[in-house]
Interface confidence: low
């Protein structure tokens, strides 16, 4: 009688992650008596996947009823496949022995390849904000896909970007792969509402790419422009000076008024107006009692925006043009923000 052969008819099997893999195996004879075991890999480091005789294998089911006397079909199904299940699976016949069964013959092996979807791309921007005209880098990462072939594109507000570098890891064979891309983006003053998009296309996505986004509002800092103007006299001996803070982002801003270099008042931008491009405007007033000054007054509006070094704008107030009232010692009044001062 011809010696038993273990036949694994499929050289390779391709399965999508989450699905069930069927690994086929048949024996050509019932003799010798003994169990079948399935292994992933060969040699001493191989992993036991299924043992007909004993053990608990929650993800593995047999195709046929192995308890039937004449059964020669030892095919198995492995459920809920992940990329980590990729590898070569061997169906091995053992001969009944005492005390232990002895390996008798192995099938040629079936290579299980897994198609796995990439994870949702995660886009991250620079750690610190940057100002318009500067170039900043964005990274995009996606993991866990198989096979290795993948396409990644970058967009800013729908326009494809060309300045980027992409790597797929690892370089050699692996159960699953990761992609990492870095794109360079030049910021403009209009970018508060802009978005950077990373788009990943893979065979498992059936033409419906995955996208990750980053809002440039998290990245950009638009420094303010300052304008100090003197308003018409509100009352005799009083001059109203305004500091217009325009086109800044983000909102975090502190303003300090200085009279001849001495701090008169500090306030934080609260009630701001928003421009169409997402930047903010704000205005602060200072009511100066000119009768308290003998000489001309240098008024400075100093602004610290988003933790950056202060910028300032000055205005010279000519005291000589106003009659001086004796006995008054108040140089300036706290007026607060534009919400509380409607002149």
């Amino acid at each position: 009688e011809e010696e038993l052969q273990v036949i694994q008819p499929d050289k390779s099997v391709l399965v999508a992650a989450g699905e069930t893999a069927t690994l086929r195996c048949t024996a050509t004879s019932l003799i010798p008596v003994g169990p079948i075991q399935w292994f992933r890999g060969a040699g001493p480091g191989r992993e036991l996947i299924y043992n007909q005789k004993e053990g608990h294998f929650p993800r593995v089911t047999t195709v046929s009823d192995l308890t039937k006397r004449n059964n020669m079909d030892f095919s198995i199904r492995i459920g809920n496949i992940t990329p980590a299940d990729a590898g070569t699976y061997y169906c091995v016949k053992f001969r009944k022995g005492s005390p232990d069964d002895v390996e008798f013959k192995s099938g040629a092996g079936t290579e299980l390849s897994v198609r796995a979807k990439p994870s949702a791309p995660v886009v991250s921007g620079p750690a610190a904000r940057a100002t318009p005209q500067h170039t900043v880098s964005f990274t995009c990462e996606s993991h866990g896909f198989s096979p290795r072939d993948i396409t990644l594109k970058w967009f800013k507000n729908g326009n494809e970007l060309s300045d980027f570098q992409t790597n797929v890891d690892p370089v050699g064979e692996s159960v699953s792969y990761s992609i990492h891309s870095t794109a360079k983006v030049v910021l403009t003053r209009e970018d508060v509402h802009s978005q950077v998009i990373c788009e990943v296309a893979h065979v498992t996505l059936q033409g419906d790419p995955l996208r990750g986004t980053a809002n440039l509002s998290e990245t950009i800092r638009v420094p303010p422009t300052l304008e100090v103007t003197q308003q018409p006299v509100r009352a005799e001996n009083q001059v109203n000076v305004t500091c217009q803070v325009r086109k800044f982002y983000p909102q975090r801003l502190q303003l300090t008024w200085l009279e001849n270099g001495n701090v008169s008042r500090t306030e934080t931008a609260s009630t701001v107006t928003e421009n169409k491009d997402g930047t903010y405007n704000w205005m602060s007033w200072l009511l100066v009692n000119v009768s308290a000054h003998r000489d001309d007054v240098k008024l400075t509006c100093q602004v610290e925006h988003d933790g950056q070094p202060a910028v300032s704008k000055s205005h010279d107030l000519k005291v000589s043009a106003h009659p001086k009232e004796q006995g008054s010692n108040t140089a300036a009044e706290n007026t607060g923000s534009n919400e509380r001062n409607i002149y």
């Epitope: 480091g45 992993e47 996947i49 929650p58 993800r59 990329p83 980590a84 299940d85 890891d169 990761s178």
Partner: antibody, heavy 122, light 107 residues
């Protein structure tokens, strides 16, 4: 044959840091989670955390966050664990052990390194 | 975190004895439990995975079983090389946790 070879014993002063290594051979290194386990003298085993070399994804036991930092050098098939701000209670043998990513049950904690003894002493 | 309560913490037995070590999980872990063997100065060795599957090269006198959240390691006939410390390890949920260990000593 898969082998995990760990770096040699270390004696370090309190407050200092130490970086342990675990070199894998005999298989595709990147396909596995590399775990680290602590065993204080005369005590049981405690899981510290794990790293997945493909993308350096890490998972930590909350107890060891801030104490242990796991990194990997894929090209050298080596995993590292840095222990910082060392105190006497960090004196222990530290083991690396390997598990397949989302594995079939067969691959969890199957291979173990020989362990590295870290002694914290002034 | 899942607590693994292992008992006894130590036991004395003779060669040829039947030895049973148990581990109780504080919540359902399915069958995701390993049994490990540790000998002084040697690398830790996994004996059993998925509750009852014997690792390659592990003698058949070792066996594992489960009843709900109670897990048992049985050595049917203790041999001189089996004197060691045994740990259970759950890998159902991170952080992965070990039992406190059982030291098997010679009587």
């Amino acid at each position: 044959e898969v082998q995990l070879v760990q770096s040699g014993a270390e004696v370090v002063k309190p407050g200092a840091s130490v970086k342990l290594s675990c070199k894998a051979s005999g298989s595709t290194f990147t396909s596995y989670w590399m775990h680290w386990v602590k065993q204080a003298p005369g005590q049981g085993l405690e899981w510290i955390g794990a790293i997945y070399p493909v993308n350096s994804d890490t998972t930590y036991n909350q107890k060891f966050k801030g104490k242990a930092t796991l990194t990997v050098d894929k090209s050298a098939s080596t995993a590292y664990m840095e222990l910082s701000s060392l105190r006497s209670e960090d004196t222990a043998v530290y083991y690396c052990t390997r598990s397949f990513y989302y594995s079939l049950d067969a691959a969890w904690f199957v291979y173990w390194g020989q362990g590295t003894l870290v002694t914290v002493s002034s | 975190d899942i607590q693994m309560t292992q008992s006894p913490s130590s036991l004395s037995a003779s060669v040829g004895d039947r030895v049973t070590i148990t581990c109780r999980a504080s919540q359902d872990i399915g069958s995701r439990l390993n049994w490990l063997q540790q000998k002084p100065g040697k690398a830790i060795k996994r004996l059993i995975y998925a509750t009852s599957s014997l690792d390659s090269g592990v003698p058949s006198r070792f066996s594992g079983s489960r009843s709900g959240t109670d897990f048992t390691l049985t050595i049917s006939s203790l041999q001189p090389e089996d004197f060691a410390t045994y740990y259970c390890l759950q890998y159902a949920s991170s952080p992965f946790t070990f039992g406190q260990g059982t030291k098997v000593e010679i009587k």
